[in-house]
């Protein structure tokens, strides 16, 4: 079941997926000039069983200038006895991420992509907050929201974090400055709290906020 | 509450233009694709087209290419199905729905009854 | 693109079970596992009953169950009641980006 709204935006933080629940989207975008192949995919889907996950279907972006004028050969979604075995890895992911059941990577870049990309998550969704650079956990509750269903509905949970300046407060007793790059990832989705000096993007992509969509940018 | 909300019926004479409407509301409604369906009197359903709010790429039925426009205004959330030249056999309901997740149409309008007759 | 097939009509009486076949090609059914099921009440909207071939959204009965074979899908209603009746219609996405449904069932509940 999709999730009707986007993670709850905090001041001052981004969120991001460590892995993506089975039936999340992630939409065929492309850069300025450039447009999904005519009969491309429209998104990718992180579909599977129960003992491997991975990305159905390839976004293809072609220029806007020049038309097709020969045909081009599709990569289209696989039929479910043909599916890939092996997982779609990107040299940028850290081996872990998508050790969790029913959960797909982040997928690799593709030709011409937009700088943003929009996910589509669904019920079951764990996303993480970090304090964006220059800024500080204040606070040390759980940094991470899921997507619930409750009485048919889907709501996100609220993260519990604060990220202020670094000159606005001392820093609070035994937490540590934020690293350059803290190798600490959460082991459970269910048991872990997450603040900003645990947690750390682990790709070459940052989550950025916009209103009404959840986007990753390319920096 | 994730809706989609389609324009009032339409009683129109043969050759005559007409658009309607579908607004998307409560979900990113320009993220999400949104797909045109013809349900002709007793008759079943029909894939027109879906379009793409966000940049309006559009893809047609081959049976409907030619012989409707799909566009979007994603500033005001909304999709449209427009006729240049209406015909009697254009006398339909039509639906409008968001694609979802594994290429299904997961929220439907309501539809809109366009009635063409001379 | 021709319409997937399925039967016209199909009725049984309340607690018994129906099946309804969607047969398309190896272009659409047989190619991927994007089928779906629509349930249409008289004078309603289409409804989502289930995508992914099995899958079902919240909501719906597990009473509600699919399977696909080759390039035949097919609807199973267990414990027939009289507000299923309805018409059904199966949907396929296809190997060139676009969409296909079926005809349609017509489901008395006697």
């Known amino acids: 079941e999709l999730c009707d709204d986007d993670p709850p935006e905090i001041p001052h933080a981004t969120f991001k997926a460590m892995a993506y629940k089975e039936g999340t989207m992630l939409n065929c975008e492309c850069k300025r000039g450039f447009r999904r192949i005519k009969s491309g995919s429209l998104y990718m889907l992180c579909t599977g069983n129960s003992s491997h996950s991975s990305w159905d279907n390839q976004c293809q972006c072609t220029s806007s200038a020049t038309r097709n004028t020969t045909k081009q050969v599709t990569p289209q979604p696989e039929e479910q006895k043909e599916r890939k075995t092996t997982e779609m890895q990107s040299p940028m992911q850290p081996v872990d991420q998508a050790s969790l059941p029913g959960h797909c990577r982040e997928p690799p870049p593709w030709e011409n992509e937009a700088t943003e990309r929009i996910y589509h998550f669904v019920v079951g969704q764990m996303v993480y907050y970090q304090c964006v650079q220059g800024y500080r956990a204040l606070h040390r509750g759980p940094a991470e929201s899921v997507c619930k269903m409750t009485h048919g509905k889907t709501r996100w949970t609220q993260p519990q974090l604060i990220c202020t300046g670094e000159m606005e407060t001392s820093q609070f007793p035994g937490e540590e400055k934020p690293q350059a790059s803290p190798e600490g990832r959460p082991e459970s989705e269910t048991s872990c709290l997450v603040t900003t000096t645990d947690f750390q993007i682990q790709t070459e992509m940052a989550a950025t906020m916009e209103t009404s969509i959840f986007t990753t940018e390319y920096q | 509450q994730v809706q989609l909300v389609q324009s009032g019926a339409e009683v129109k004479k043969p050759g005559e233009s007409l658009k309607i409407s579908c607004k998307g509301s409560g979900y990113s409604s320009t993220s999400y694709w949104i797909g045109w369906v013809r349900q002709m009197p007793g008759k079943g359903l029909e894939w027109m087209g879906i379009i793409y709010p966000g940049d309006s790429d559009t893809r047609y039925s081959p049976s409907f290419q030619g012989q409707v426009t799909i566009s979007a205004d994603k500033s005001i959330s909304t999709a449209y199905l427009q006729w240049s030249s209406l015909k009697a056999s254009d006398t339909a309901m039509y639906y409008c729905?968001?694609?979802?997740?594994?290429?299904?149409?997961?929220?439907w309008g309501r539809g809109t009854m366009v009635t063409v007759s001379s | 693109q021709s319409a997937l097939t399925q039967p016209a009509s199909v009725s049984a009486s309340p607690g018994q079970s129906i099946t309804i076949s969607c047969t398309g090609t190896s272009s659409d059914v047989g190619a991927y596992i994007y089928v779906s099921w629509y349930q249409q009440l008289s004078g309603k909207p289409p409804k989502l009953i289930l995508y992914d071939v099995s899958k079902r959204p919240s909501g719906i009965s597990d009473r509600f169950s699919g399977s696909k074979s080759g390039n035949t899908a097919s609807l199973t209603i267990s414990g027939l009641q009289a507000d299923d009746e309805a018409d059904y219609y199966c949907?396929?996405?296809?190997?060139?980006?676009?969409?296909?449904f079926g005809g349609g069932t017509q489901l008395t509940v006697l």
């Open positions: 949907s396929s996405y296809t190997r060139s980006s676009t969409w296909v």
């Open positions: 729905a968001r694609l979802g997740s594994y290429y299904a149409f997961d929220i």
